[in-house]
C-alpha cells in the first residue's frame, strides 16, 4: 500500500502539520496538538488523562486516535487511578522522610537531614558532623566511624599526625622538621631548598623575594631583596603597617594595605577618611514615600512631605482639603493622598498662590516658558545657540573655552550659531576632515585611531600598550594578590582567586567566620584563618554550643525527680524528703507527736506511734476509760493510764471500796457502852448516866456548837469535831489546800476551792482529775 503523499492536492497536512520526505516516502510531521496521517485528529493525550505520573500513548482504534496509559509503579486502571497495595501506601518513612517505590513490595526512604535507616527511624549519628579536619563520617551500628585524611587520626580526626616522626625523615640534607597541625614544615640548611630540602640552593633561583621584590645574589648561598614600596623584611615578606598616625576619623577603623591604608567607616560615614556623611537619601531612593523630599542630616535624614502626606516617611494620608486652603478663588479637589487646586487664569502653584509669570510671554520667540512652582517666576528653556533669562542673548560659541573648530581652524560667532574658517588641508563644518591615515585601521584591540597630518596616533583601550595597542599589559606582574591568592591577568585589570578563608580584591581580608554568629547560647566565637572555634558558656557543649548539657544525667536526685537547667539542676523531692539532692529523710518524729509515753517511729513522709497499754489513737492521745465498768462499789473511780483508782466514800476501804470499815474494832464506847457499827461511824449504847457519843461525858459540850465546819461529837469532859470535806483543825475552821496532793493527772492544772478543788484539763483529757 502506498503511504500518504502529502504533497499531492487533497492530501495535504492539516492543522499546521509539515510535509517532510524521508526514505523515499512523504509523511506529515504534526505539531503536539494534533495526530494522525494528515494531522487530522486532536491529540487525545493533550488533556493529560493518565493520572499519578502515568504515561499517555496515542493508539489507533479502527482509524480513530485514542490513548492508552502506562501506569507508574503502584497504580493501575485505564487512567491509573486505582492504587495497588504497595509498600509506600501507608507512608512507612518516619520523621518527614519521602517514600520511593523500588518494587511493589520494596521501598527506599529519602530521609531529611539528621535521620537515617531504612525508614528514617534512626537519628543519624553523622548529623552533628563529628569528624573534624575533613574526616569522612560513616554510620556504624548505633554510632559512627571517622575516615581521617592522612594528616589527622583519632576517633574524630582531631589528633594531628606527627609527620616528623617518620623514618626516614621527610626533610633531607640535614633539614630540620617542624610538625604543624595537619602538615609539617622543613627548615633547610643554607645549602638546600624546596618543601623537603631536596634541591641545592641557588641564590635568586627561584627568587625568594616576595611581593614583587627583586633578588640579587651576594654570595654562594646569600642574596639580597630590593623590596617594592610598602614591603620590608629579608624577603620582602612583611607588609609595612601604614596605619600608625592614620587619618581615619569618626570611629573609622584603619585597614593596612600595600604602601597605603584604607579606612573602614561606620555606617553613617564614608569617604577616604570617613569624613563624609553618608547621604541616606542617595542610599535609599525610596526613603521618603509619595513624592516626599529627602534631606540628609548627620547620621540620619528628614522627609519633607508633599501636601496630603505626613509621617516620618510621608506614608500617612491626610484629608488635604480639610486643612489646605486654595488661594484666590481656586477650587480644591480632594484626591487620594493629596489635593489639587484648580487655579483661575493667571494663577499658578500648588495652592494657586502665585501669579503665573508666563502670562506676559517673557521668553524670546522659539523658547519654551515654564512656571516655577515654588515662586511663580518664568523659567525659559532656550534653543541651541541662545542663553539668558529670556533666551534673548546669543551664545558666543567661540569663547566657551575649547575652540570648537579643529586643527586650529578660526571660529567666527554668528547669531545662534558659529562658523569655522579652516587651515589649508582641512575641511568640514568644524575643520575636522583631513587626509585620513586611519583608513587602513592600524590600531588593534578596539583602540581609537587619531588621524594627524601625515600620520596617525593610536589611543589604546585600558590594559593595552604599544604603537598599535598590540601588547596586553600584564597587571599580574607586581604579584598583587596576597595570602597565596592566584592572579588572573585580565584586560586593564587583574582578578585574584583567593584561597578559602580570605576575601577582598587583593585577598587582603581574613573572612570573619564569626560574623554569622555560629556559636549559640552566649558562646564566645574565636575567628581563625578559614575556621572558627566556639568557647561555650557553662552548661553548653557541641561544635556550636547548641547542646544543653543534661545535668540530670546521671540522675543526682536520690528521692525525687530531676529538672534540668542551664549549668544547673533542681531536685523536686518526693514528700518526706529534703536537701539539694533529696537525700535527707525528714524526721516527722522530731515534733514528738506521740502522747502518753507512746514511742514514735519515722516513716517516708509519715510517722507511726506505738502506744502504751491503755492508750490509743494516731498520736496515742486517747486514754482508754478503765472506769467504764464502774469498778468502785462505794467510791469515785479515777481513770489512770492502763488502770484506775477508787476514792472511797467515808467508811469504806479496799481497792474497790467494797469493805465497810468496822469503827467498833477499837472499842470506842467507854464506861461499859455497847458499840454498834455503822457506815463511816458507830453508835454507842451508853449505860444510864452517860450520854455523849462514846459514853464518856455526862455534860454535852456540843451544845455550844464549837465545830464551825463539821459535826460535833460529845465526849466525857470534851467533844470531837468531824470536819466537812476540805476543812480541818480542832473546830474545823482551817480550810485545807486539796491541791497539795497533785490530784490532777495528765498535766491538768489544779485550783483550790473552799470545799475541794477543780482540775483544768489539757486538750484531749477530761474527768474530775483529767483522768
Amino acid at each position: 500500500a502506498r503511504g500518504p503523499r502529502c504533497s499531492q492536492p487533497g492530501e495535504t497536512c492539516l492543522n499546521g502539520g509539515k510535509c517532510e520526505a524521508a526514505n523515499g516516502t512523504e509523511a506529515c510531521v504534526c505539531g503536539g496538538a494534533f495526530v494522525g496521517p494528515r494531522c487530522q485528529d486532536p491529540n487525545p493525550c493533550l488533556s493529560t488523562p493518565c493520572k499519578n505520573a502515568g504515561t499517555c500513548h496515542v493508539v489507533d482504534r479502527r482509524g480513530v486516535a485514542d490513548y492508552a496509559c502506562s501506569c507508574a509503579l503502584g497504580f493501575s486502571g485505564p487512567l491509573c487511578l486505582t492504587p495497588l497495595d504497595n509498600a509506600c501506601l501507608t507512608n512507612p518513612c518516619r520523621n518527614g522522610g519521602t517514600c520511593d517505590l523500588l518494587t511493589l513490595t520494596e521501598y527506599k526512604c529519602r530521609c531529611p537531614p539528621g535521620w537515617s535507616g531504612k525508614s528514617c527511624q534512626q537519628a543519624d549519628p553523622c548529623a552533628s558532623n563529628p569528624c573534624a579536619n575533613g574526616g569522612q563520617c560513616l554510620p556504624f551500628e548505633a554510632s559512627y566511624i571517622c575516615h581521617c585524611p592522612p594528616s589527622f587520626h583519632g576517633p574524630t580526626c582531631r589528633q594531628d599526625v606527627n609527620e616528623c616522626g617518620q623514618k626516614p625523615g621527610l626533610c633531607r640534607h640535614g633539614g630540620t622538621c617542624h610538625n604543624e597541625v595537619g602538615s609539617y614544615r622543613c627548615v633547610c640548611r643554607a645549602t638546600h631548598t624546596g618543601p623537603n630540602c631536596e634541591r641545592p640552593y641557588v641564590p635568586c633561583s627561584p627568587s625568594p623575594c616576595q611581593n614583587g621584590g627583586t633578588c640579587r645574589p651576594t654570595g654562594d648561598v646569600t642574596h639580597e631583596c630590593a623590596c617594592l614600596p610598602g614591603f620590608t623584611g629579608q624577603n620582602c615578606e612583611e607588609n609595612i603597617d601604614d596605619c600608625p598616625g592614620n587619618n581615619c576619623k569618626n570611629g573609622g577603623a584603619c585597614v593596612d594595605g600595600v604602601n597605603t591604608y584604607n579606612c573602614r567607616c561606620p555606617p553613617e560615614w564614608t569617604g577616604q577618611y570617613c569624613t563624609e556623611d553618608v547621604d541616606e537619601c542617595q542610599l535609599m531612593p525610596n526613603a521618603c514615600q509619595n513624592g516626599g523630599t529627602c534631606h540628609n542630616t548627620h547620621g540620619g535624614y528628614n522627609c519633607v512631605c508633599v501636601n496630603g502626606w505626613t509621617g516620618e516617611d510621608c506614608s500617612e494620608n491626610i484629608d488635604d482639603c480639610a486643612s489646605a486652603a486654595c488661594f484666590h478663588g481656586a477650587t480644591c479637589h480632594d484626591r487620594v493622598a493629596s489635593f489639587y487646586c484648580e487655579c483661575p487664569h493667571g494663577r499658578t502653584g500648588l495652592l494657586c498662590h502665585l501669579n503665573d509669570a508666563c502670562i506676559s510671554n517673557p521668553c524670546n520667540e522659539g523658547s519654551n516658558c515654564d512656571t516655577n512652582p515654588v515662586n511663580g517666576k518664568a523659567i525659559c528653556t532656550c534653543p541651541s545657540g541662545y542663553t539668558g533669562p529670556a533666551c534673548s542673548q546669543d551664545v558666543d560659541e567661540c569663547s566657551l573655552g575649547a575652540n570648537p573648530c579643529e586643527h586650529a581652524g578660526k571660529c567666527i560667532n554668528t547669531l545662534g550659531s558659529f562658523e569655522c574658517q579652516c587651515l589649508q588641508g582641512y575641511t568640514g563644518p568644524r575643520c575636522e576632515i583631513d587626509v585620513n591615515e586611519c583608513v587602513s585601521n592600524p590600531c588593534q584591540n578596539d583602540a581609537t585611531c587619531l588621524d594627524q597630518i601625515g600620520e596617525f596616533q593610536c589611543i589604546c583601550m585600558p590594559g593595552y600598550e604599544g604603537v598599535h595597542c598590540e601588547v596586553n599589559t600584564d597587571e599580574c606582574a607586581s604579584s598583587p594578590c596576597l595570602h597565596n591568592g592566584r592572579c588572573l591577568d585580565k584586560i586593564n585589570e587583574f582578578q585574584c582567586e583567593c584561597p578559602t578563608g580570605f576575601t577582598g580584591h587583593l585577598c587582603q581580608y581574613d573572612v570573619d567566620e564569626c560574623a554569622s554568629t555560629p556559636c549559640k547560647n552566649g558562646a564566645k566565637c574565636l575567628d581563625g584563618p578559614n575556621t572558627y572555634t566556639c568557647v561555650c558558656t557553662e552548661g553548653y557543649t557541641g561544635t556550636h554550643c547548641e547542646v544543653d548539657i543534661d545535668e540530670c544525667d546521671p540522675d543526682p536526685c536520690h528521692y525525687g525527680s530531676c529538672k534540668d537547667g542551664v549549668a544547673t539542676f533542681t531536685c523536686l523531692c518526693r514528700p518526706g524528703y529534703t536537701g539539694h539532692h533529696c537525700e535527707t529523710n525528714i524526721n516527722e518524729c522530731s515534733s514528738q507527736p506521740c502522747r502518753h509515753g507512746g514511742t514514735c517511729q519515722d516513716r517516708d513522709n509519715a510517722y507511726l506511734c506505738f502506744c502504751l497499754k491503755g492508750t490509743t489513737g494516731p498520736n496515742c492521745e486517747i486514754n482508754l476509760d478503765d472506769c467504764a465498768s464502774s469498778p468502785c462499789d462505794s467510791g469515785t473511780c479515777l481513770d489512770k493510764i492502763d488502770g484506775y483508782e477508787c476514792a472511797c466514800e467515808p467508811g469504806y476501804t479496799g481497792s474497790m471500796c467494797n469493805i465497810n470499815i468496822d469503827e467498833c474494832a477499837g472499842n470506842p464506847c467507854h464506861n461499859g457502852g455497847t458499840c454498834e457499827d455503822g457506815i463511816n461511824g458507830f453508835t454507842c449504847r451508853c449505860p444510864e448516866g452517860y450520854h455523849d457519843p462514846t459514853c464518856l461525858s455526862e455534860v454535852n459540850e456540843c451544845n455550844s456548837n464549837p465545830c464551825v465546819h463539821g459535826a460535833c461529837r460529845d465526849s466525857l469532859n470534851g467533844y470531837k469535831c468531824d470536819c466537812d470535806p476540805g476543812w480541818s483543825g480542832t473546830n474545823c475552821d482551817i480550810n485545807n489546800n486539796e491541791c497539795e496532793s497533785n490530784p490532777c493527772v495528765n498535766g491538768g492544772t489544779c485550783k483550790d476551792m473552799t470545799s475541794g478543788y477543780v482540775c483544768t484539763c489539757r486538750e484531749g483529757f477530761s474527768g474530775p482529775n483529767c483522768q
Partner: nanobody, 117 residues
Framework: EVQLVESGGDLVQPGGSLRLSCAAS????????MGWSRQAPGKERELVAS???????LYADAAKGRFAIYRDNSKNTVYLEMNSLKPDDTAVYYC???????????WGQGTQVTVSS
C-alpha cells in the same frame, strides 16, 4: 521470610460482624507497621486498614466507621474488627506487614471472608 498466622475468616450474613487476627514473630512485630489488605474476585488487591508501631491508624474510605484496627503488643498480634458487613466486603483478607528495618512489604496467605444471606 516473615511468618504470619491469620485467622477469623468465615461466612457471615449481611449486617454481621467478624474479627480477623494476625500473629507475627516478636522481632518483626515490634519493628513493623501492621495492617490488612483484601482482594475481591477479578479486582486488584486494595488496602483496608493499617496501624503504625506507635498506634496511628489509617483506613480506606470503604472501611471508615465500620472497621477498627488495633494491635496487642504483648501478644504480637494485630486485629481487624469488622461490623455492619456488606456483600461488597466479600474478599480474601491478607495480613500486611511493612518491615521498617528491611524496607519491605510482606503479605500473609490470606483468610476468606464471605458476606451472603
Amino acid at each position: 521470610e516473615v511468618q504470619l498466622v491469620e485467622s477469623g475468616g468465615d461466612l457471615v450474613q449481611p449486617g454481621g460482624s467478624l474479627r480477623l487476627s494476625c500473629a507475627a514473630s516478636a522481632t518483626v512485630f515490634s519493628n513493623s507497621d501492621m495492617g490488612w489488605s483484601r482482594q475481591a474476585p477479578g479486582k486488584e488487591r486494595e488496602l483496608v486498614a493499617s496501624i503504625t508501631t506507635d498506634g496511628n491508624t489509617l483506613y480506606a474510605d470503604a472501611a471508615k466507621g465500620r472497621f477498627a484496627i488495633y494491635r496487642d503488643n504483648s501478644k504480637n498480634t494485630v486485629y481487624l474488627e469488622m461490623n455492619s458487613l456488606k456483600p461488597d466486603d466479600t474478599a480474601v483478607y491478607y495480613c500486611r506487614v511493612v518491615d521498617l528495618l528491611r524496607g519491605k512489604l510482606y503479605w500473609g496467605q490470606g483468610t476468606q471472608v464471605t458476606v451472603s444471606s
